[in-house]
């Protein structure tokens, strides 16, 4: 399927609007600090060039690869060295090394100002004045802050963003209409970004085989009626799509994702009975819908797994002939029977099965060696079940905020070297598992909770990788993708940690806390809690609770005072002294 001009091919396939949007996303994800106007200029130049290639595929430079064309364009940025430092050295390299170099410099935590939402009238005016620029700016701001955001899905978010403004800017109460929609898009966007970040980490850190195993398990749960060959084909195609997007090949990724959605809808009879509604939607909605579609019903009367994978005399023969195919079949068969298991649990079972066969098939009596392998899965299944049960009970007892605080204390004690903002962000997200998953019945709790925790712990891993400070975090993050959560769960208090020096400034608060939103106020308090644990890692739950209750009362009191600033200064000193005494600081 070779084309004389790759850029012309993608322009024609995607259309001008999507082409321009995807190039903007690609550039913003690579050069995260560049001003919006500079990116728009680069995108326009690339688009004009693409049009010349559509008109004549043999025109000069039209035969160049997209990496070459885009890389050359990025390397024309005048301030590259001043703004990005050593990333400028990428421009001295040739493709494919140059693109790899750009990828390595993507920053998961760029030093960018927080996005502040303007007044609704201001936003609506900007939307009406120049809709195209307004929407481009949305793509730019999201892409530069989330350099691994799934590009075709970002197009879907932008479409919903546009629809929200189109509808709400003519509503009687613009704010009541718009703000909940923007909140929903923000929250969904953060979740989408984190999920995609895990897919990219899986591919980049653990390789294609790890991603394919994940995809086999997930798609087999979702499409239990599909044949193994069908699932394998979907896995191959899905792996190509995500490899491209994670590698910065956004045009190819979006194009291939559209092809995959088309294939799924054309073959839904042999894939799933749940796809009908999705397949009636326009392209972006269709792809999103397929990605989120509920699990199909399991076929009736599926035979026992033991027959083919334990009792058969051909187990070792079948394994030896095609190891990955045989293990893939095991994973497919197990996953389609267990929508109640998390994907990571299914992968742990498959890994255990693989290791067991690897050792047993070399033994004198292989069957005697692996005969009861399925019985040995029991503790692997029970461990996440028990953990989820205990934590959901704790969540129901405490509520989300206090549950987050319990996790903040737990994780700060495990890995106190990690930066306070990272511990707060990650623990808050870990705590959201309660409201997200504990409401579900037993059969849906584990896939919801443990697969969500994998996404959140990956955030910890990628943030920590940028500035590594803890060997324990590095170990849990790098040893095994599927065992990250059990690895972190197994960590006890870090006895080697030397408590942080007490700094009164850390616990000094001002009247500005009173004007913060409830969420921002919680973050302030949770930041103080982490610092408290770093100062006194041996503090008991009761001691910490007492100090935090005093702190909450102090904030409430001073926010009601006439002279707030004086109250914060005077009462704050007393609180610090009382806290020091209570904790023996």
């Amino acid at each position: 399927d070779a084309h004389k001009s790759e850029v012309a091919h993608r322009f024609k396939d995607l259309g001008e609007e999507n082409f321009k949007a995807l190039v903007l996303i690609a550039f913003a994800q690579y050069l995260q600090q560049c001003p919006f106007e500079d990116h728009v200029k680069l995108v326009n130049e690339v688009t004009e060039f693409a049009k010349t290639c559509v008109a004549d595929e043999s025109a000069e430079n039209c035969d160049k690869s997209l990496h070459t064309l885009f890389g050359d364009k990025l390397c024309t940025v005048a301030t590259l060295r001043e703004t990005y430092g050593e990333m400028a050295d990428c421009c001295a390299k040739q493709e494919p090394e140059r693109n790899e170099c750009f990828l390595q410099h993507k920053d998961d935590n760029p030093n960018l100002p927080r996005l502040v939402r303007p007044e609704v009238d201001v936003m609506c005016t900007a939307f009406h004045d120049n809709e195209e620029t307004f929407l481009k700016k949305y793509l730019y701001e999201i892409a530069r802050r989330h350099p691994y955001f799934y590009a075709p899905e970002l197009l879907f978010f932008a479409k919903r963003y546009k629809a929200a403004f189109t509808e709400c800017c003519q509503a009687a109460d613009k704010a009541a209409c718009l703000l909940p929609k923007l909140d929903e898009l923000r929250d969904e966007g953060k979740a989408s970004s984190a999920k995609q970040r895990l897919k990219c980490a899986s591919l980049q850190k653990f390789g294609e085989r790890a991603f394919k195993a994940w995809a086999v398990a997930r798609l087999s749960q979702r499409f239990p009626k599909a044949e193994f060959a069908e699932v394998s084909k979907l896995v191959t195609d899905l792996t190509k799509v995500h490899t491209e997007c994670c590698h910065g090949d956004l045009l190819e990724c979006a194009d291939d994702r559209a092809d995959l959605a088309k294939y799924i809808c054309e073959n839904q009879d042999s894939i799933s009975s749940k796809l009908k509604e999705c397949c009636e939607k326009p392209l972006l909605e269709k792809s999103h819908c397929i990605a989120e579609v509920e699990n199909d019903e399991m076929p009736a009367d599926l035979p026992s797994l033991a027959a083919d994978f334990v009792e058969s005399k051909d187990v070792c023969k079948n394994y030896a002939e095609a190891k990955d195919v045989f293990l893939g079949m095991f994973l497919y068969e197990y996953a389609r029977r267990h929508p109640d298991y998390s994907v990571v649990l299914l992968l742990r079972l498959a890994k255990t099965y693989e290791t067991t066969l690897e050792k047993c098939c070399a033994a004198a009596d292989p069957h005697e060696c692996y005969a009861k392998v399925f019985d040995e899965f029991k503790p692997l299944v029970e461990e996440p079940q028990n953990l989820i049960k205990q934590n959901c009970e704790l969540f129901e007892q405490l509520g989300e905020y206090k549950f987050q605080n319990a996790l903040l204390v737990r994780y700060t004690k495990k890995v106190p070297q990690v930066s306070t903002p990272t511990l707060v962000e990650v623990s808050r997200n870990l705590g959201k598992v309660g409201s997200k998953c504990c409401k579900h019945p037993e059969a849906k709790r584990m896939p919801c909770a443990e697969d969500y925790l994998s996404v959140v712990l990956n955030q910890l891993c990628v943030l920590h990788e940028k500035t590594p400070v803890s060997d324990r975090v590095t170990k849990c993050c790098t040893e095994s993708l599927v065992n990250r959560r059990p690895c972190f769960s197994a960590l006890e208090v870090d006895e080697t940690y030397v408590p942080k020096e007490f700094n009164a400034e850390t616990f000094t608060f001002h009247a500005d806390i009173c004007t913060l939103s409830e969420k921002e106020r919680q973050i302030k308090k949770q930041t103080a809690l982490v610092e408290l644990v770093k100062h006194k890692p041996k503090a008991t739950k009761e001691q910490l609770k007492a100090v935090m209750d005093d702190f909450a009362a102090f904030v409430e009191k001073c926010c009601k005072a006439d002279d707030k600033e004086t109250c914060f200064a005077e009462e704050g000193k007393k609180l610090v002294a009382a806290s020091q005494a209570a904790l023996g600081l």
Partner: nanobody
């Protein structure tokens, strides 16, 4: 990585009893089989007993059947070997070993992790 530490070795009279213990640490949240091996002076290291992760299946070498009992507490990541009716020919360095996976492994080559060993001497 799984780290293993044996304890409980010592000098015992023929017909006496001894209990060896092995504590595992490290990556103990993945399934692993545990076993005991022994090596007498100038001899090959031989398999004594093994037990799976759940402790639901066990294996014993011919020379110790009926006298030795292997047990495991997965929650505490410990394994023990109760040795009764000890004979002079049981004198050896006893090694605790662990192997990834969930099979009942009986061969030395199947084991991935080893302890330092503890001396058992049966003599009057």
């Amino acid at each position: 990585e799984v780290q293993l530490v044996e304890s409980g070795g010592g000098l015992v009279q023929p017909g006496g009893s001894l209990r060896l213990s092995c504590a595992a640490s490290g990556r103990t949240f993945s399934p692993y089989t545990m076993g005991w091996f022994r090596q007498a002076s100038g001899k090959e290291r031989e398999s004594v007993a093994a037990t799976t992760w759940t402790g639901s299946r066990s294996y014993y070498g011919e020379s110790v059947k009926g006298r030795f009992t292997i047990s495991r507490d997965s929650t505490k990541n410990t394994m023990s070997l109760q040795m009764n009716s000890l004979k002079p020919e049981d004198t050896a360095v006893y090694y605790c070993a662990a192997a990834d996976g969930a099979g009942l492994y009986t061969n030395r080559g199947q084991y991935d992790y080893w302890g330092q060993g503890t001396q058992v001497t049966v003599s009057s």
